[in-house]
């Protein structure tokens, strides 16, 4: 009696199941009690000897490529052996690599967590994922795993992490890069500093006083509000960051405390108060201000 090994499918793709069947065309297995065993190269597969002529392999991988055969043994211990069948496991090259961010959109607050998620639409086997920072890439990390996605985490984002990023996926058919993703780090404003600038050391009534408010840190645009004794004087915007100025034509009522507030939508900060006082120098014919 002759024995045949049939693999279904005969050309499996990595990760897919395969059923091996040990067939005896001229013998009904019910005619005699048979025990079956399946082999790859020199190694017995599965449970070893079994009464079932089928062996189910849940997932085939590239390294499972090889020469397979089966044996059947009668109660009388006569062993039949099939011819060897070559099973080639086909690897699917990685394709359509994409990089996404968590939080989505690539905008992240300073100090928050950023996750760069690299995904492939297709690809089987061990996939090596690599993450790069900058268009001329600095390699941040690599991970090899049997999955279609992998993550790179920055636990606490800093200002210096604002850059372009991309990832690369590779499973033996050459590297495939994702598109670029830009990360914007949003920085809340620092406490602003208010400076009073007058045209001369002792400003007089009718002089123009410049109130200059500046937060040294903070993502633009920054809106600055100017206050005199907690009464709003007005606001100025700094679309590209930096400071902003508000001009005031002085009168005697302008003595008192001045402050400013910076707000970039990520939080507001108020400056320390600066006091402006009128003084009347001896022999002077007009009021003067000092701060």
């Amino acid at each position: 009696a002759e024995l045949f090994l049939i693999a279904s499918p005969s050309h499996p793709t990595e990760g897919s199941p395969v059923t091996l069947t040990c067939k005896m065309p001229f013998l009904q297995s019910s005619d005699a009690q048979f025990q079956f065993c399946f082999f790859r190269d020199t190694r017995a597969l599965g449970p070893g000897w079994s009464s079932s002529p089928k062996l189910q392999i849940a997932a085939m991988w590239k390294e499972d490529t090889g020469s397979y055969w089966c044996e059947a043994q009668t109660m009388a211990s006569k062993v039949l052996r099939s011819r060897r069948s070559q099973i080639n496991v086909h690897r699917v090259p990685v394709a359509d690599v994409s990089l996404e961010t968590q939080p989505p959109g690539g905008q992240v607050m300073e100090g928050d967590r950023l996750v760069l998620i690299c995904s492939v639409a297709m690809g089987t086997g061990d996939i090596t994922f690599l993450w790069y920072k900058g268009a001329v890439g600095l390699n941040l990390q690599s991970k090899t795993q049997r999955s279609l996605t992998a993550e790179y985490e920055i636990p606490s984002v800093r200002e210096s992490d604002a850059e372009q990023y991309y990832c690369v996926a590779e499973n033996g058919y050459g590297p495939s890069p994702s598109g670029l993703v830009s990360i914007t780090v949003r920085i809340p404003v620092s406490r602003p500093i208010l400076m009073l600038r007058a045209p001369r050391a002792q400003a007089a009534v009718e002089d123009v006083l410049e109130l200059h408010c500046e937060a040294l840190r903070g993502s633009p645009p920054i809106l600055y509000w100017f206050y005199h004794e907690d009464i709003t004087l007005g606001s100025r915007s700094a679309p590209s960051g930096g400071g902003a100025s508000f001009n005031l034509s002085l009168t005697e009522e302008h003595s008192g405390n001045y402050s400013c507030e910076a707000n970039n939508g990520l939080g507001a900060q108020r400056s320390e108060a600066v006091t402006l006082n009128f003084t009347v120098p001896t022999g002077a014919r007009s009021n003067h201000l000092t701060s």
């Epitope: 001329v136 372009q164 598109g179 993703v181």
Partner: antibody, heavy 119, light 112 residues
Framework: QVQLQQSGPELVKPGASVRISCKAS????????IHWVKQRPGQGLEWIGW????????KYNEKFKGKTTLTADKSSSTAYMQLSSLTSEDSAVYFC????????????WGQGTTLTLSS | DVLMTQTPLSLPVSLGDQVSISCRSG???????????LEWYLQKPGQSPKLLIY???NRFSGVPDRFSGSGSGTDFTLRISRVEAEDLGVYYC?????????FGGGTKLEIK
């Protein structure tokens, strides 16, 4: 297939400004940086700078800062280069090119836009 | 700026010749990430440049194997083993390691 189609030749007066366009097709516009390169008649190539169309982030050659402004419109997949306060030194052919990261090379170039200054 | 100096300026050849073009950088063009971003482009009259070699020695897809690149640090060479008529034009080396990125002055390959 990937294409970078640049706007036609420009004849402009000294002191004026001009905007050259580079329309991308056949790929995801926001996935790659677009670079600009200058070539004066009979001379070599000079790198001007790049723009990332995803967020408009730019990097310039210091030599071209103030002269050149790079912008991009995602909705039309078009990159632009504005040249201001034109002088005879700006008469040149300007190319846009896509640079593919990781492999790091200019794989596709526009056909070039000729800028001529005439008083 | 990194000065890229190409020699010769002009290279008269006969078809079938083997030729070499040299490119020297004013400083090392090894990037901080370890890569050397040295490329070679060919520009034919009235056309945009076309990539031949990237990262010193990698041939771009579709580029004939008669083109090869070599070198390291500051000295780089482009070789054409057997010049064909379609190879005529101006060859530029380019460094993308240090901003501003710079091109060489060009080498014109022409028939003797």
């Amino acid at each position: 297939q990937v294409q970078l189609q640049q706007s036609g030749p420009e004849l402009v007066k000294p002191g004026a400004s001009v905007r050259i366009s580079c329309k991308a097709s056949g790929y995801t516009f926001t996935s790659y940086n677009i670079h600009w390169v200058k070539q004066r008649p009979g001379q070599g190539l000079e790198w001007i700078g790049w723009i990332y169309p995803g967020d408009g982030n730019t990097k310039y050659n210091e030599k071209f800062k103030g002269k050149t402004t790079l912008t991009a419109d995602k909705s039309s997949s078009t990159a632009y280069m504005q040249l201001s306060s034109l002088t005879s030194e700006d008469s040149a052919v300007y190319f846009c090119a896509r640079r593919i990261h990781y492999f790091d090379y200019f794989d596709y170039w526009g056909q070039g836009t000729t800028l001529t200054l005439s008083s | 700026d990194v000065l890229m100096t190409q020699t010769p300026l002009s290279l008269p050849v006969s078809l079938g010749d083997q030729v070499s073009i040299s490119c020297r950088s004013g400083q090392t063009i090894v990037h901080s990430n370890g890569n050397t971003y040295l490329e070679w482009y060919l520009q034919k009259p009235g056309q945009s440049p076309k990539l031949l070699i990237y990262k010193v020695s990698n041939r771009f897809s579709g580029v004939p194997d008669r083109f090869s690149g070599s070198g390291s640090g500051t000295d780089f060479t482009l070789r054409i083993s057997r010049v064909e008529a379609e190879d005529l034009g101006v060859y530029y080396c380019f460094q993308g390691s240090h901003v501003p990125w710079t091109f060489g002055g060009g080498t014109k390959l022409e028939i003797k």
